[in-house]
Structures are given as structure tokens and as C-alpha cells.
């Protein structure tokens, strides 16, 4: 798999980690989360050209079949390879509690 | 998450397992694989509307932010949740060998 800077479509256009600022309202969390009021959401965005950051054999197959049958088989998709945990201060019936989520923020990305 | 048959876009249009028949030539494997000569490739194809088969909290966030910023944040993508192993008879310098691949065929799908 090529590294993140070796994008044949031009710098920054291929699958990589992006940060999107979002409020609790944006996320639909305002009714159950107290803090943070704003989250720097890290997510995987970008194109997956041939063999770029291919996650596994399945991704390689998908690339080959997409080239042959682009209307039937989609190109591989840029998704999280791993996650960073995040703590939320959640509203409860009686007050607040701390809860850590392991699958909330993307840590790095690959194509699958 | 809604089940696979509860697609708001119409039956079979949301993220689910599809089978695509592919030859060794289609896959670009003809020079290193002897058998099978044809593979029933199972892969994940289909749309990921709001909360459909959401893999985790990250997928839910992505749905919310895609709704708000469709030009910046893509919708969740239909990808394998797990795989079925597959054995290939591979050509070697001296003959053939059996090799099992764990990440070749999608077993079930989710949106992320």
C-alpha cells in the first residue's frame, strides 16, 4: 500500500484522516451529552485509487473488479483502520457519569 | 440499527452481501494462482442511509455530519464486518502449495 502522501490524484485527495469540528447539536447529542460542547471529530475521507492504502486482499479484489465492472462493483472506500478513544460526560437520570467510547474517533485510515 | 431487509430506499438497495463471479484473469491472479479458476466473490455493496447497519458510534457521527455537510463529509460506506476464509492453490517455483486467506471474501456487511 502506498503511503498517505503518494496520492496519484494530487496531494490530500486520497484517503486520509481529516478533522471536522462539530457541536453537540451537530452530532445530535445535546440531549444526552453534557461535555465536551464541541468535538474535533477525526474521520477518514478521500478517494481510494488502485491499491492506495489497500487494507487487505479483499480491497485488492474490489479494485480489480471495479476496474472491470464500475457500474456493479464500487471502488474501495476510505474507512478507519483503528480508533482513538474519547471520554464523554453523559447526562443520567440522577446527574452525570463518565463514559469512554472506543469507536468514536478515527485514528488512521485505509481503503476497503 | 435496522436489519438488512428494512431498506428505506427499496428492497436490495441498501448495504448487503452480493456475489460477483470473477475469473483468475479478472482478478489479476492468473500468473500466481492455479485454482479455483473462477471465484464467487462475496462483497459488500449498497447504500448506507441514516443509521442503516451502523457499525459503531463513528458511523452514527458520520451520518449526522454528512446530513449537515454533504459536500465535506461522505455518507457511511458499506464494507465487510467479517470475512470467510478461502483456500487457493498457488503456483510456486517448484510446483504448487495450498494457502488459506482470511481476508478475501466478505461474510457480512455494515456501514462505516
Amino acid at each position: 500500500a502506498r503511503n498517505g502522501d503518494d496520492c496519484p490524484l494530487g496531494p490530500g485527495r486520497c484517503c486520509r484522516l481529516h478533522t471536522v469540528r462539530a457541536s453537540l447539536e451537530d452530532l445530535g447529542w445535546a440531549d444526552w451529552v453534557l461535555s465536551p460542547r464541541e468535538v474535533q471529530v477525526t474521520m477518514c475521507i478521500g478517494a481510494c485509487p488502485s491499491q492506495f492504502r489497500a487494507a487487505n486482499m479483499h480491497a485488492q479484489i474490489k479494485t480489480s473488479l471495479h476496474r472491470l465492472k464500475p457500474d456493479t462493483v464500487p471502488a474501495p472506500c476510505c474507512v478507519p483502520a483503528s480508533y482513538n478513544p474519547m471520554v464523554l460526560i453523559q447526562k443520567t437520570d440522577t446527574g452525570v457519569s463518565l463514559q469512554t467510547y472506543d469507536d468514536l474517533l478515527a485514528k488512521d485510515c485505509h481503503c476497503i | 440499527a435496522r436489519n438488512g431487509d428494512d431498506c428505506p430506499l427499496g428492497p436490495g438497495r441498501c448495504c448487503r452481501l452480493h456475489t460477483v463471479r470473477a475469473s483468475l484473469e479478472d482478478l489479476g491472479w492468473a500468473d500466481w494462482v492455479l485454482s479455483p479458476r473462477e471465484v464467487q466473490v462475496t462483497m459488500c455493496i449498497g447504500a448506507c442511509p441514516s443509521q442503516f447497519r451502523a457499525a459503531n458510534m463513528h458511523a452514527q457521527i458520520k451520518t449526522s455530519l454528512h446530513r449537515l455537510k454533504p459536500d465535506t463529509v461522505p455518507a457511511p460506506c458499506c464494507v465487510p464486518a467479517s470475512y470467510n476464509p478461502m483456500v487457493l492453490i498457488q503456483k510456486t517455483d517448484t510446483g504448487v502449495s495450498l494457502q488459506t486467506y482470511d481476508d478475501l471474501l466478505a461474510k457480512d456487511c455494515h456501514c462505516i
Epitope: 461535555s35 465536551p36 474535533q40 482513538n84 478513544p85 474519547m86 471520554v87 460526560i89 469512554t100 474517533l105 | -
Partner: antibody
């Protein structure tokens, strides 16, 4: 279960550098939103916030003490360190480390007593 | 720096009574105020977050209220185990600051 434990020299002389260690378990400083703060309390007095360090290595210091304070972390070993240079008798206190979540000290260590005496 | 003032250093109450501990911020801190309880010989313990939200496990006789500059911690039906010092803290901006503390004495 979150636990924090402070360790320090117990006693040191004026002008020396105080080195404190906070060893914690039950959470990770690689978690977004998580921090560790240091607070001190002279005997019979109130609480004074000293410094904190966040998951992303952001650091904040008490403005009155900033020139003397250095906070750092070892994320993989679940430890946070605080150094206070040029101590004097006014730095005699119980020093606490606490798990900080979005500005709030959710869990505190038992504290370590530090005496500065010649 | 934001100064948090707890004007009453000591408060005396009886078991079963209701008592209110007050805290005043030198400038608007919204609801970014926490309350802590420190029993004799122990480390502080979190009670209230965001001015009015009880932390999990804190008895419901502890109630926080207020916003802006004036904040109150109310203990209804005071128990003997509530003998402690209570501190407010603002986290609206750095440096983080604590009130001077209010010691609750049980008659």
C-alpha cells in the same frame, strides 16, 4: 476503577527542585478529553491548582507559578510528572494529582505530603 | 484570574437540617462550576459538575444550582457523614481556581 497515586521526596531543602510522580490506572491519557491535573493544599488551607496536561499534550500552568513549573507525561506507563524548581517553605503542602475531564477533577489521589525545610 | 469567593468559612447545622453553601465568581463563568467534598484527613471527592449535575454515586440530598456568578450547593436532610469542607471550582477559563472552602460542622 480509577485510581491515582502521588509519590514525592517527602522532605527537601529550599532552592531544590521538587519532583512529583502521579501513577494512575483505570483510564488512559491517550483518550480524547482526558487530562491529569496537580493541585496542592497547605495544611489547614484551601486548594490551589498548579498545572494540568491533556491527552493531546496541551499543558496549562498556574500563572503565578508558571516560571517554576514543568508538567510532562508518559502515556504508555500511565504516569504524569510535575517539577517545581527553586522551592521554599511556602511550597510545603499536600500535593494531589487528579483525573481531569473537561476541566473537572473527577477522581483524586490520596495526596503526598511535601515539606520544605532547611 | 477568576476569583471564587466562599464567604462563609464555617457553617453549623444539625442532622436532618437543610444547609446552603454559596460561592461567588468574580466574573461570569456560565455554568462551568464544580463542587467537591473533602472529609477530614481525606482527599477531595467530586460532587457536582456543570453547576447542577450530581456525579454518579453522589446522594440526591446534594443539589447544585446557579449560573453566571452566583452558585449554591444545598444539602438537604444533612447526615453526620456530611461533616466535611466543601469547595467550589470554576473551569470556565485558565487558570482554574477554587473557592477558599466552607467547613460544615454538625451540632
Amino acid at each position: 476503577q480509577v485510581t491515582l497515586k502521588e509519590s514525592g521526596p517527602g522532605i527537601l531543602q529550599p532552592s531544590q527542585t521538587l519532583s512529583l510522580t502521579c501513577s494512575f490506572s483505570g483510564f488512559s491519557l491517550s483518550t480524547y478529553g482526558m487530562g491529569v491535573g496537580w493541585i496542592r493544599q497547605p495544611s489547614g488551607k484551601g486548594l490551589e491548582w498548579l498545572a494540568n496536561i491533556w491527552w493531546n499534550d496541551d499543558k496549562y500552568y498556574n500563572s503565578a507559578l508558571k516560571s517554576r513549573l514543568t508538567i510532562s507525561k508518559d502515556t504508555s506507563n500511565n504516569q504524569v510528572f510535575l517539577k517545581i524548581s527553586s522551592v521554599d517553605t511556602a511550597d510545603t503542602a499536600t500535593y494531589y494529582c487528579a483525573q481531569e475531564v473537561y476541566g473537572w477533577f473527577a477522581y483524586w489521589g490520596q495526596g503526598t505530603l511535601v515539606t520544605v525545610s532547611s | 484570574d477568576i476569583v471564587m469567593t466562599q464567604s462563609q468559612k464555617f457553617m453549623s447545622t444539625s442532622v436532618g437540617d437543610r444547609v446552603s453553601v454559596t460561592c461567588k465568581a468574580s466574573q461570569n463563568v456560565g455554568t462551568n462550576v464544580a463542587w467537591y467534598q473533602q472529609k477530614p484527613g481525606q482527599s477531595p471527592k467530586a460532587l457536582i459538575y456543570s453547576a447542577s449535575y450530581r456525579y454518579s454515586g453522589v446522594p440526591d440530598r446534594f443539589t447544585g444550582s446557579g449560573s453566571g456568578t452566583d452558585f449554591t450547593l444545598t444539602i438537604s436532610n444533612v447526615q453526620s457523614e456530611d461533616l466535611a469542607e466543601y469547595f467550589c471550582q470554576q473551569y470556565n477559563s485558565y487558570p482554574l481556581t477554587f473557592g477558599g472552602g466552607t467547613k460544615l460542622e454538625i451540632k
